[in-house]
């Protein structure tokens, strides 16, 4: 029997079979954020837990300085959830006075950075107006999709307001990617 | 040609190639819930349809008594959506009287249970304050991420209030997992 | 060495090994929608970008006329996010007049069409009441799950109101599927 027999008839020479268990994978979980400088019109990036609790990186997928480093070109499924929480926004105060206004908002962006290209690429965005009425509000934004990434690409999660991120539990705010 | 030729140079002996079609997988869909006893501070678990309509389990992934049973150690992508619906919460009534208050909330938790340890592990949580103004409200909470699971682990979906779960359609409320 | 050596002991004859890189995959992104006729009780389908920017189809997964065509039977993970935005709904105006009412809503449905079967199948639905108070509101609905599909099946994304879909950015509204 030849190894060929298990390969489908359209098997490409350039796409070798490989064990699923050795594919780059990561699931990162929230940690308390330290206030950092960021440009006025640029959303700050979150930093993450990469080795404690439910968090892990494996098979050459590494986390460093807010970035997930892509070790191998291919199609990746990338996902993140950020849970936000805050006090009633000004929106409701203004509204109570009978004046319509542009609502506050919360936004999550998963961004790709390629060293050879100066401008980051926004892969995924979840954005929601927040015009809550109760005195405390909280809600998650979830994102996930498949992208073709190149070896050396870096992924990060940016948010509109780092002070609204719920960092209390590893199951509420997280970020992950795996090679398909 | 030897079987070796399709294995990448970093192929591990302990990670054999395997057909994708024989990996454990399940997609479960909502059924009407029967009221069950649960401890005061413990969210009740949903039970699920596992074989009718869009629901299925395959390749030794089994569903029994509210739990998905993990038949093989590895990295799994786990997901769930729960659609909630309700009448206007007290929150808005109190608000109309001009008194601020802590909003009601809806929560979904995907939980892992390991027989060797009595305490469940919360893998994923989606939680949202609900302070709706219309007389009827409805909304989904979606969760999904990758976790390292062991053979024998059990997965369930817990919710903050089982009576608010929309069980009317299999496409609105569901739960699934598959080995990567 | 025989090719057999990398196949686990439960390898099925009917499930040949195959390279991950040649599996059908697609990620489609939003484009501006052209108003189209649709039946009164049927949600309109979105059309999509399939080759520019972040969008792609590969390995015989094709996009044509609002549909993703499934080229090979198997288990697929299917996902979509639709970001909606609108002006304050009538709901809040009526509410201000003190009359309770059924809230407006936004809905996304991922639908499967099988030529041999007359009735489309709703695979996934995300539906949310909208009773916003600020003058402009926006929010995403995300869906994703695994389904067993047959060669020749067609997938589309339907929405409750095409005029509320945010088509401005490819990272806000998207649709994808990949063979597991």
């Amino acid at each position: 029997l030849k190894g060929q027999e298990f390969a489908p008839s359209h098997q490409q020479v350039y796409a070798p079979l490989r064990a699923d268990g050795d594919k780059p994978r990561a699931h990162l979980t929230v940690v308390r954020q330290t206030p950092t400088q960021h440009f006025k019109n640029q959303f700050p990036a979150l930093h993450w837990e990469h080795e404690l609790g439910l968090a892990f990186t494996k098979n050459r997928m590494n986390y460093t300085n807010k970035f997930l480093l892509i070790p191998e070109s291919g199609d990746y499924f990338i996902y993140s959830q950020v849970t936000f929480r805050g006090m009633t926004s000004e929106c409701s105060e203004i509204r109570q006075a009978g004046r319509p206004n542009k609502p506050d908002s919360i936004t999550v962006v998963i961004t790709k950075v390629t060293d050879s290209y100066p401008e980051p690429t926004q892969l995924l965005m979840g954005t929601k107006s927040v015009c809550e009425v109760g005195s405390n509000w909280f809600q998650p934004i979830y994102l996930g999709a498949m992208f073709s990434l190149q070896e050396g690409d870096k992924l990060m999660v940016n948010v509109s307001d780092i002070s609204l991120v719920d960092y209390t539990k590893e199951d509420k705010t997280f970020f992950g990617a795996f090679l398909l | 040609l030897k079987g070796q030729e399709f294995a990448p140079s970093h192929q591990q002996v302990y990670a054999p190639l395997r057909a994708d079609g024989d990996k454990p997988r399940a997609h479960l869909t909502v059924v009407r819930q029967t009221p069950t006893q649960h401890f005061k501070n413990q969210f009740p678990a949903l039970h699920w349809e596992h074989e009718l309509g869009l629901a299925f389990t395959k390749n030794r992934m089994n569903y029994t008594n509210k739990f998905l049973l993990i038949p093989e150690s590895g990295d799994y992508f786990i997901y769930s959506q729960v659609t909630f619906r309700g009448m206007t919460s007290e929150c808005s009534e109190i608000r109309q009287a001009g008194r601020p208050n802590k909003p009601d909330s809806i929560t979904v938790v995907i939980t892992k249970v390991t027989d060797s340890y009595p305490e469940p592990t919360q893998l994923l949580m989606g939680t949202k304050s609900v302070c709706e103004v219309g007389s009827n409200w409805f909304q989904p909470i979606y969760l999904g991420a990758m976790f390292s699971l062991q053979e024998g682990d059990k997965l369930m979906v817990n919710v903050s209030d089982i009576s608010l779960v929309d069980y009317t359609k299999e496409d609105k409320t569901f739960f699934g997992a598959f080995l990567l | 060495l025989k090719g057999q050596e990398f196949a686990p002991s439960h390898q099925q004859v009917y499930a040949p090994l195959r390279a991950d890189g040649d599996k059908p995959r697609a990620h489609l992104t939003v484009v501006r929608q052209t108003p189209t006729q649709h039946f009164k009780n049927q949600f309109p389908a979105l059309h999509w970008e399939h080759e520019l920017g972040l969008a792609f189809t590969k390995n015989r997964m094709n996009y044509t006329n609002k549909f993703l065509l499934i080229p090979e039977s198997g288990d697929y993970f299917i996902y979509s996010q639709v970001t909606f935005r609108g002006m304050t709904s009538e709901c809040s105006e009526i509410r201000q007049a003190g009359r309770p009412n059924k809230p407006d809503s936004i809905t996304v449905v991922i639908t499967k069409v099988t030529d041999s079967y007359p009735e489309p199948t709703q695979l996934l639905m995300g539906t949310k009441s909208v009773c916003e108070v600020g003058s402009n509101w926006f929010q995403p609905i995300y869906l994703g799950a695994m389904f067993s599909l047959q060669e020749g099946d067609k997938l589309m994304v339907n929405v409750s109101d095409i005029s509320l879909v945010d088509y401005t950015k490819e990272d806000k509204t998207f649709f994808g599927a990949f063979l597991l």
Epitope: R32, E51, G53, A55, F56, T57, K58 | E119, T121, S148 | -
Partner: antibody, heavy 119, light 106 residues
């Protein structure tokens, strides 16, 4: 009650290898990450490395790479540290110690295992 | 790696006296913890996350600091506080300990 029960003291010859065990009870073994710490002659504490029983992931202090190998057996809730090619410099008390999240610090410590390397 | 320097290395205090020891980091850290160790026993978590007292730690202990400078304070020294105190950072691997401050009772 949380307990980390380490194996007993060891007298080993230079060049030999040995394995210390640490059996955890009273908490979720896979919920906490196991660390190993060296204390020479009642002096400084040195972090050797960690292993996360949930994921199997390890992180070693560069200084101890090739000297220590960390493993776990989830079925018995036991962590192990193998020390290789021992020299007199490796004579010390070794502690296993578990942490939940990094803002918590090391919550639980074993009683320590005294390793003496001598001909 | 981040080097943690504790000072003083050794100090003594009379019962009722206020005691302060410091831990200086070579780079900024987010997560600083303190452990108490008495002779012949394992270290115990004493103060975590800069300022939180571990279970069973008397309220006369407090912790403070940020960035590269942290301290542990005892408002009123008692005999049972005589021990060695180690700081440890959990911000950057390897997760280093300070050299310890040995606190003796006069």
């Amino acid at each position: 009650e949380v307990q980390l029960q380490q194996s007993g003291p060891e007298l080993v010859k230079p060049g030999a290898s040995m394995k210390i065990s640490c059996k955890a009870s009273g908490y979720s073994f896979t919920g906490y990450t196991m660390n190993w710490v060296k204390q020479s002659h009642g002096k400084n504490l040195e972090w050797i490395g960690l292993i996360n029983p949930y994921s199997g992931g390890t992180n070693y202090n560069q200084k101890f790479k090739g000297k220590a190998t960390l493993t776990v057996d989830k079925t018995s809730s036991t962590a192990y540290m193998e020390l290789l090619s021992l020299t007199s410099e490796d004579s010390a008390v070794y502690y296993c110690a578990s942490i939940y999240q990094r803002h918590d610090g090391i919550a639980y410590w074993g009683q320590g295992t005294l390793v003496t390397v001598s001909a | 790696q981040i080097v943690l320097t504790q000072s003083p290395a050794i100090m003594s205090a009379s019962p009722g006296e206020k005691v302060t020891m410091t831990c200086s980091a070579s780079s900024s850290v987010n997560y600083m913890h303190w452990y108490q160790q008495k002779s012949g026993t394992s270290p115990k978590r004493w103060i975590y996350d800069t300022s939180k007292l571990a279970s069973g730690v008397p309220t006369r202990f407090s912790g403070s600091g940020s960035g590269t400078s942290y301290s542990l304070t005892i408002s009123s020294m008692e005999a049972e506080d005589a021990a060695t105190y180690y700081c440890q950072q959990w911000s950057s691997s390897p997760y280093t300990f300070g050299g310890g401050t040995k606190l003796e009772i006069k």
